[in-house]
């Protein structure tokens, strides 16, 4: 379902950060997925194929991500803790045609008792 | 230099986690990069090309990563804090030939004052 559904966990917790999963249909071959916090684009990942079927991945905002055949997961290690924010994913489908753009289902994420938890001392 | 060098920062700090960068020569087209903590393999990423030059990425340990044309960066969001550990990268080169395996330069990572810093309350 291109409009997204609630049958997957959009947010999952990792020490000090959150993984946000943006689902898309397995039939989609080429796409752009953007993660928004309110109106701000936090992450953008584009997967396209060339004329010889070679795959190119563009990650211009250098987000940590994991791409599978039906989801893009972005890892935010410093989510905004000032207030509860609404996060949602926006999907552009290039292939198969026709071109489509859809806002997928989103969710509110509220962070509390947030603090810098670790200090690292690095010896090289 | 395939054996690695100290001219890049292997570790970089992110809230609650650490990014470990494994550099490789830009001439390498197909490779396997493994991240070790002491003798334990934490992450493994393989980039290969098929007969049609389509790129395949295998990430069997489902690590968060970023791949560029000269490095693989792994993000560990729960590094072992029990003691200082030695981390190093191991590179297997498939293309260009001949096949080579190299342990790249490593480094000690010591974590202190580690604690669970954030609790997330998730509303979907």
């Amino acid at each position: 379902e291109i409009n997204g559904s609630a049958d997957h966990r959009m947010f999952s917790f990792h020490n000090g950060g959150v993984q946000i999963s943006c689902k898309y249909p397995e039939t989609v071959q080429q796409l752009k997925m953007r993660l928004f916090r309110e109106r701000e684009v936090l992450c953008e990942l584009t997967k396209t194929k060339g004329s010889g079927n070679a795959v190119s991945i563009k990650n211009p905002m250098l987000c940590l991500y994991h791409l599978s055949n039906n989801s893009v997961s972005f890892f935010l290690n410093n989510p905004d803790s000032s207030q509860g924010s609404y996060y949602f994913c926006s999907l552009s489908i290039f292939d198969p045609p026709p071109f489509q753009e859809r806002n997928l289902s989103g969710g509110y994420l509220h962070i509390y008792e947030s603090q810098l938890c670790c200090q690292l001392k690095l010896w090289l | 230099e395939i054996n690695g060098s100290a001219d890049h920062r292997m570790f970089s700090f992110h809230n609650g986690g650490v990014q470990i960068s494994c550099k490789y020569p830009e001439t390498v087209q197909q490779l396997k990069m493994r991240l070790f903590r002491e003798r334990e393999v934490l992450c493994e990423l393989t980039k290969t090309k098929g007969s049609g030059n389509a790129v395949s990425i295998k990430n069997p340990m489902l690590c968060l990563y970023h791949l560029s044309n000269n490095s693989v960066s792994f993000f560990l969001n729960n590094p072992d804090s029990s003691q200082g550990s030695y981390y190093f990268c191991s590179l297997s080169i498939f293309d260009p030939p001949p096949f080579q395996e190299r342990n790249l330069s490593g480094g000690y990572l010591h974590i202190y004052e580690s604690q669970l810093c954030c609790q997330l309350k998730l509303w979907l």
Partner: antibody, heavy 117, light 111 residues
């Protein structure tokens, strides 16, 4: 309106070099893979090579591999084909084409390259 | 490399004729439910124009008399009622793998 305009063709001696350009307009150039396709006089179409959005992935036909290079300047919306060590069989009209995700959906008018001594 | 063949190499036709052009690939072009096969039209002195992609999907603005069909290794471009403006060369092309290759072409001429 999508427009692709090739330039740089002409007469070149065997073993010589030539650089073709393709100026793109009417679309977001950096969003697309771009290709070069050639057509020898009175013959069919032959794919030459392609380049991805950022120039990280470049592929070539076996007939030109090692002699031709493809590059792009996204700031200038321009695609390039550098032809080195040219042979008589490289004589052709060279088209730049936009790969529209599942086909070449836009082509330039072509530029003729003649390799002759 | 995948080899593409076309038949016939040329065909003399009249207005209103049903025209059939065949294209064959040396290996299957079917993947994930899609056939990676394209048809182009090229008129004399012009650049090629996209007609059909994924073997059977008409490109925007292409008249519905152009029909693509087939799957796997055997494909057909049919012009249900030939018009004089359809004169030119027709090429099939695969994009299943690299290098993407074209068929040798089929020339349509007036009878």
């Amino acid at each position: 309106e999508v427009q692709l305009v090739e330039s740089g063709g002409g007469l070149v001696k065997p073993g010589g070099s030539l650089k073709l350009s393709c100026a793109a307009s009417g679309f977001t150039f950096s969003d697309y893979w771009m290709d070069w396709v050639r057509q020898a006089p009175g013959k069919g179409l032959e794919w030459v090579g392609n380049i991805d959005h950022d120039g990280n992935i470049i592929n070539f036909a076996p007939s030109v591999k090692g002699r031709f290079t493809i590059s792009r300047d996204n700031a200038k919306n321009t695609l390039y084909l550098q032809m080195n060590s040219v042979k008589s069989e490289d004589t052709a009209t060279y088209y730049c084409a936009r790969w529209g995700h599942y086909a070449f959906d836009s082509w330039g008018q072509g530029t003729l390259v003649t390799v002759s001594s | 490399d995948i080899v593409m063949t076309q038949s016939p190499s040329s065909l003399a036709v009249s207005a209103g004729d049903k025209v059939t052009i065949n294209c064959k690939s040396s290996q299957s072009l079917l993947s994930s439910g899609y056939n990676y096969l394209i048809w182009y039209q090229q008129k004399t002195g012009q650049a090629p124009k996209l007609l059909i992609f994924y073997a059977s999907t008409r490109h925007t603005g292409v008249p519905d008399r152009f029909i693509g069909s087939g799957s796997g290794t055997d494909f057909t471009l049919t012009i249900t009622s030939f018009q004089t403006e359809d004169l030119g060369d027709y090429y099939c092309q695969h994009h299943y793998s690299s290098p993407p290759t074209f068929g040798p072409g089929t020339k349509l001429e007036i009878k």
